[in-house]
């Protein structure tokens, strides 16, 4: 806490500029008007303030806006955002995607901090759902964002937003999350033709039921082994040898390398040896 002291003569700040970097902490507290700071927040990032000086500026904004900063200030916080606590951020009402982008840019290249997580939560709750533009922005900054959400939170993702999802965004999703996302993806991509549909739906297939895998097997999709290995075991088990052969296409020979791993192992054990022998891979049920 900086002690309240009168501003020395001639030091009263008329604008936020580089001369302020030479001010001691107490001088910043005494000589910089909080309202001036709020209107010229965009200048703060261009000035090499020390962490201690930034603490003073934050304190001034906190005093001016005890109920939480307005968006006009939040949008220009820049590196001052790193000084905010989750408790500070919970007071904010962030509605502009531009504001969100500006603050995510500050944290770019780092793990998602509690501050960023709180900011995103506030933003999404304010919007009511994860729309396409928001999802596009969040996954661009944090590819694992989608998989950090609970199945309940994912249920608020509208099918239209699925178009923004890239394969790498789903890398860390577990089966429960894919169970929620797959039906949305199926709906989102339903008007695409066979091969284009498969390219888009492939990353979500960890949530696909048996009947959808059977349907895909009739479409010359040539599913690769990496995708097959991520399918739900309960969805794979009812597939026949012929269906798996058609589903995998040329990739079917990769079953031999994966015969000890799930879901391949469990699937092999469910098949008749005569049927497995038709593959010519030497798979033993």
């Amino acid at each position: 806490e900086v002690e309240k002291t009168a501003c020395p003569s001639g030091k009263k700040a008329r604008e936020i500029d580089e001369s302020l970097i030479f001010y001691k902490k107490w001088e910043l507290e005494a000589c910089v008007d909080a309202a001036l700071l709020a209107t010229q927040m965009d200048r703060v990032n261009a000035i090499p303030f020390t962490y201690e000086q930034l603490d003073v500026l934050k304190h001034k904004l906190d005093e001016l806006y005890p109920q939480g900063y307005p968006e006009s200030v939040i949008q220009h916080l820049g590196y001052l955002f790193l000084k905010m606590s989750p408790e500070d951020i919970r007071k904010w009402n962030v509605t502009s995607l531009e504001t969100l982008k500006a603050l995510l840019e500050v944290n770019k290249g780092h793990e998602m901090s509690p501050q960023v997580a709180t900011l995103i939560d506030r933003f999404v709750k304010g919007r009511g759902q994860l729309d396409k533009d928001t999802l596009d922005t969040l996954t661009a900054f944090y590819p694992g964002y989608l998989c950090s959400l609970s199945p309940e939170e994912l249920s608020s993702v509208p099918p239209s937003s699925i178009w923004a999802v890239r394969p790498q965004d789903l890398d860390t999703c577990d089966p429960r999350q894919l169970d929620v996302l797959y039906p949305k993806a199926r709906l989102a991509f339903q008007n695409m033709n066979g091969s284009e549909y498969f390219v888009k739906i492939q990353s979500f297939l960890g949530g696909a039921p048996t009947e959808d895998l059977k349907a895909l097997s009739q479409q010359n999709v040539s599913m690769d082994l990496a995708t097959f290995m991520k399918l739900r075991t309960d969805a794979v088990l009812p597939l026949t040898v012929a269906e798996v052969q058609k589903l995998l296409g040329p990739h079917v020979e990769g079953l031999k390398a994966e015969e000890r791993h799930r879901p391949v192992r469990d699937w092999i054990l469910r098949q008749r040896q005569d049927d497995l022998d038709t593959l010519g891979l030497g798979l033993q049920g």
């Epitope: 296409g249 020979e253 390398a257 010519g280 891979l281």
Partner: antibody, heavy 115, light 108 residues
Framework: EVQLVESGGGLVQPGGSLRLSCAAS????????IHWVRQAPGKGLEWVAS????????SYADSVKGRFTISADTSKNTAYLQMNSLRAEDTAVYYC????????WGQGTLVTVSS | DIQMTQSPSSLSASVGDRVTITCRAS??????VAWYQQKPGKAPKLLIY???SLYSGVPSRFSGSRSGTDFTLTISSLQPEDFATYYC??????????FGQGTKVEIK
Amino acid sequence: EVQLVESGGGLVQPGGSLRLSCAASGFNIYSSSIHWVRQAPGKGLEWVASISSYSSYTSYADSVKGRFTISADTSKNTAYLQMNSLRAEDTAVYYCARYYAMDYWGQGTLVTVSS
Amino acid sequence: DIQMTQSPSSLSASVGDRVTITCRASQSVSSAVAWYQQKPGKAPKLLIYSASSLYSGVPSRFSGSRSGTDFTLTISSLQPEDFATYYCQQGPYYHPITFGQGTKVEIK
């Protein structure tokens, strides 16, 4: 994206040796068979050799048996074709391909055996 | 080793024609037969695998069938980009592979 890139071709004298490489990306060669196929100038396709790393299986065409050796380094995701005692009739573009149903092929590397 | 005898070695056809190429195996074989298309200076491209399965992304005018030891590639309506050389190939897993001699499809 799946890609196969051959290298190591060139001009060699009869009786000489060459080692061709097939660098794979976008998939794991451990769980895939890799094949070498050659094509002499103006001629058709001729299978040369196959390897399945996961089952330690190798196979050769009669025309190269005892002279060529196929191998794979799964840590480098690369397959090789060591060609010894080369003959004029081995002159060809050499392709590597993935799977028995060869869904991806490299661009090919030219091997010329001539004195 | 199994031989694959491909016929004809060349044929002339017009755009829109139905084209059929046949490969006969020298002995009983499994359905592990594939068909490839190759254009000059390029690597072959897979069209059909397992005798009759259309490879992903290949136009549906291409089809494959089997009758005993005879394997057939059919192009239902020849397109300008289909003029090329076609090869059949047999090779069940863990067996030697053999290619047919090739069929060159030329413009009439």
